[in-house]
């Protein structure tokens, strides 16, 4: 007999991604004997928390924690019982909670405390509930994308780890309340707040990142609604034949629409707003979200924010993917070039409500908002971030890679798994019949 290596045990980690519109739970797993102090982490399972994001529970913090129970109970079953105590559990909240923290810090604290109280009741190794900064959200999304697409380290056919020669991918995330752009850059950032130095697998990376609060899809829609009320009295991005009653208090309650709030407005007043299917006016309305008037640096993206020229390939995920997927799959429109993306947005914006409903069977939820969403994505990429046709050719729209959701959660987990000691592989006496 001789010593035979047992297959390494699996370790698990849980991340609750508390976004502005909803919360998702991701359970990750990796072999306990990790390579280079970073685990070979993949998604084990996931769970969508029903209802809105935790920031929507400002008036009912205990409701936020109660809403998580179903997914936490699922985690008890998805993670083997003997691994519960050693499984780290994190909750990271993003832009929805950043906004709540700006407007009502007490409510934000109460929600996090309520959630913390519930999470500590579970047998996992709870390691905190916190609000991620925009910079963290961007960087961890970048780490996730490059980790999953094996741009940091790869297992070769000869059974050895090597570093691929290809460069890293940039990452673009469009959430409900903010959007992030992150990519590797060679030159130092003119704005130190936009630069992050990372050391991964013994390699050094200089990364540019910026998060634009209030430029997430849901907040953009609210801002466009406020602009439409202010300037038109109709909504050029909504389809003709679609109309709805809008309560002014709802439109102006977000800090993102504060600048458009009329001095004296009746918050309980209701306004009937109709769509006009006007792509050109819609484009103008969306353009108003971006300011290019001043830049204190050698170059900017928009709103005076420093950004080096976009370089290399990019992966665009979350609402970037869903918007493009809608255009491609539901509308059957080509979106391989910037010109095609613009034409697709114009196509959607030209449709009447009846045409749109007929074109998209099963009446997709909030169908009326897809025009504005498509127009915003097109403008953000081309005018905002400065993608030209050549650079846009290097953008892939993806929601998953290697059966794992692309988003900040895995990157967050990867960063934190470095704190988890690796078990040595189990050695036992056995007969080797080879």
């Amino acid at each position: 007999t001789r010593d035979v290596r047992e297959p390494p045990a699996l370790k698990y980690g849980i991340v609750l991604d508390a976004g502005s519109s909803h919360t998702s739970m991701f359970i990750y797993k990796w072999p306990a004997d990790k390579e280079n102090d970073t685990g070979i982490v993949g998604q084990h399972s996931s769970c969508d928390v029903p209802g809105g994001g935790i920031s929507s529970y400002a008036d009912n913090p205990s409701g936020a924690s109660q809403s998580l129970v179903g997914c936490l109970e699922q985690a008890l079953q998805d993670v083997p019982k003997e691994r519960h105590a050693g499984t780290p559990l994190y909750l990271g909240a993003t832009a929805g909670m950043r906004l709540l923290n700006l407007t009502n810090p007490e409510a934000s604290t109460s929600v996090l405390m309520a959630v913390t109280h519930t999470l500590t009741q579970y047998p996992f190794d709870f390691r905190g509930a916190r609000i991620l900064s925009g910079q963290e959200e961007g960087v961890f999304g970048w780490v996730t994308a490059n980790y999953l697409l094996e741009n940091f380290i790869k297992y070769g056919w000869v059974g050895r780890w090597f570093r691929p020669r290809k460069g890293t991918l940039g990452a673009m995330d469009l959430g409900g309340a903010s959007t992030q752009i992150t990519f590797e850059t060679t030159s130092p950032a003119e704005d130190r707040a936009s630069e992050v130095q990372l050391h991964l697998y013994g390699q050094h990376y200089r990364v540019y990142t910026h998060s634009f609060l209030c430029y997430g899809r849901d907040q953009v829609l609210q801002r466009l609604l406020a602009s439409a009320l202010q300037t038109h009295g109709f909504h050029p991005c909504w389809p003709r034949g679609f109309s709805t009653q809008v309560l002014l208090g709802d439109v102006y309650q977000s800090p993102c629409t504060m600048a458009q709030r009329p001095q004296n407005f009746n918050s309980s007043a209701r306004v009937s707003l109709s769509g006009s299917s006007d792509p050109h006016l819609c484009r103008d309305l969306v353009s108003g979200l971006f300011s290019f008037s001043s830049c204190p640096f050698s170059r900017c993206s928009f709103n005076g924010v420093f950004q080096p020229p976009v370089a290399g390939n990019f992966v665009a995920f979350s609402a970037f993917f869903y918007t493009v997927d809608f255009l491609r799959t539901s509308m059957g429109l080509p979106v391989a070039t910037l010109q095609q993306l613009e034409a697709a947005a114009v196509n959607v914006c030209n449709q009447t409500w009846a045409q749109l409903q007929a074109r998209v069977p099963g009446q997709r939820a909030r169908l009326a908002d897809y025009c504005a969403g498509a127009m915003f994505v097109q403008q953000l990429l081309s005018r905002g971030y400065g993608f030209d046709e050549r650079a846009f050719g290097g953008v892939i729209f993806q929601k998953k890679a290697a059966d794992t959701a692309v988003g900040w959660a895995l990157g967050y987990m990867l960063n934190l798994t470095n704190l988890i000691p690796a078990d040595p592989p189990g050695l036992r006496k056995g007969t080797d019949f080879s």
């Epitope: 519109s21 309650q253 869903y322």
Partner: antibody, heavy 125, light 106 residues
Framework: EVQLVQSGAEVKKPGESLKISCKAS????????MDWVRQMPGKGLEWMGD????????TYNQQFKGQVTISADKSIRTAYLQWSSLKASDTAMYYC??????????????????WGQGTLVTVSS | DIQLTQSPSSLSASVGDRVTITCSAS?????IHWFQQKPGKAPKLLIY???NLASGVPSRFSGSGSGTFFTLTISSLQPEDFATYFC?????????FGQGTKVEIK
């Protein structure tokens, strides 16, 4: 055709136990949560809780936690609502409802798409 | 908990009338669903996610709104529409219903 068939009306005395059922057909039972909704005489609707039959996980409205137990038997595609000790205030119509969903921007949004015919529970001494 | 307040609590109308029922939420919600309930029957889904007509529901029913204010409109009331209507939210735990609006024959 998707159908939810509930057990018949029950008349019970305070302190007695009861288990009512909801049998599903026409769809994959484990793909959807099953919820229970109470309607007291002449009143509105109240969500009580649900069961995820795939994982056998029950969640409850805090108002009903400890008062009722929700369970399911996958093998016979049936969800249950039970009381260990009934009170007169439990007199109501109880509905099971399938939790349907639609996907919007990668998020599942839920609604009750199919309902059982209801089980009337009368608790009286 | 999010309170849903329906207005009016009851109304009398004639066949052919246009009827509007409102549902006001105590906090902003993403969506509202509407149900119709006839005496002795289970509720039936009419509209999901604010404005989407459920399968088999006539086009005279429509829904709209956002945030904290939502409406259900019946463009031309038919004899079979006399019933009680409930709004329902699934944005904030626990999921709640409005108190109902009874539509009666004038």
């Amino acid at each position: 055709e998707v159908q939810l068939v509930q057990s018949g009306a029950e008349v019970k005395k305070p302190g007695e136990s009861l288990k009512i059922s909801c049998k599903a057909s026409g769809y994959t039972f484990t793909d959807y949560n099953m919820d229970w909704v109470r309607q007291m005489p002449g009143k509105g609707l109240e969500w009580m809780g649900d069961i995820n039959p795939k994982y056998d996980i029950s969640t409850y409205n805090q108002q009903f936690k400890g008062q009722v137990t929700i369970s399911a038997d996958k093998s016979i595609r049936t969800a249950y609502l039970q009381w260990s000790s009934l009170k007169a205030s439990d007199t109501a119509m109880y509905y099971c409802a399938r939790r349907g969903f639609f996907l919007y921007y990668g998020i599942n949004y839920y609604y009750f798409d199919v309902w059982g015919q209801g089980t009337l529970v009368t608790v009286s001494s | 908990d999010i309170q849903l307040t329906q207005s009016p609590s009851s109304l009398s109308a004639s066949v052919g009338d246009r009827v509007t029922i409102t549902c006001s939420a105590s906090s902003s919600v993403s969506y509202i669903h509407w149900f119709q309930q006839k005496p002795g029957k289970a509720p039936k889904l009419l509209i999901y996610s604010t404005s989407n007509l459920a399968s088999g529901v006539p086009s005279r029913f429509s829904g709209s709104g956002s945030g904290t204010f939502f409406t259900l409109t019946i463009s031309s009331l038919q004899p079979e529409d006399f019933a009680t209507y409930f709004c329902h939210q699934w944005s904030s735990y626990p999921w709640t219903f409005g108190q109902g609006t009874k539509v009666e024959i004038k």
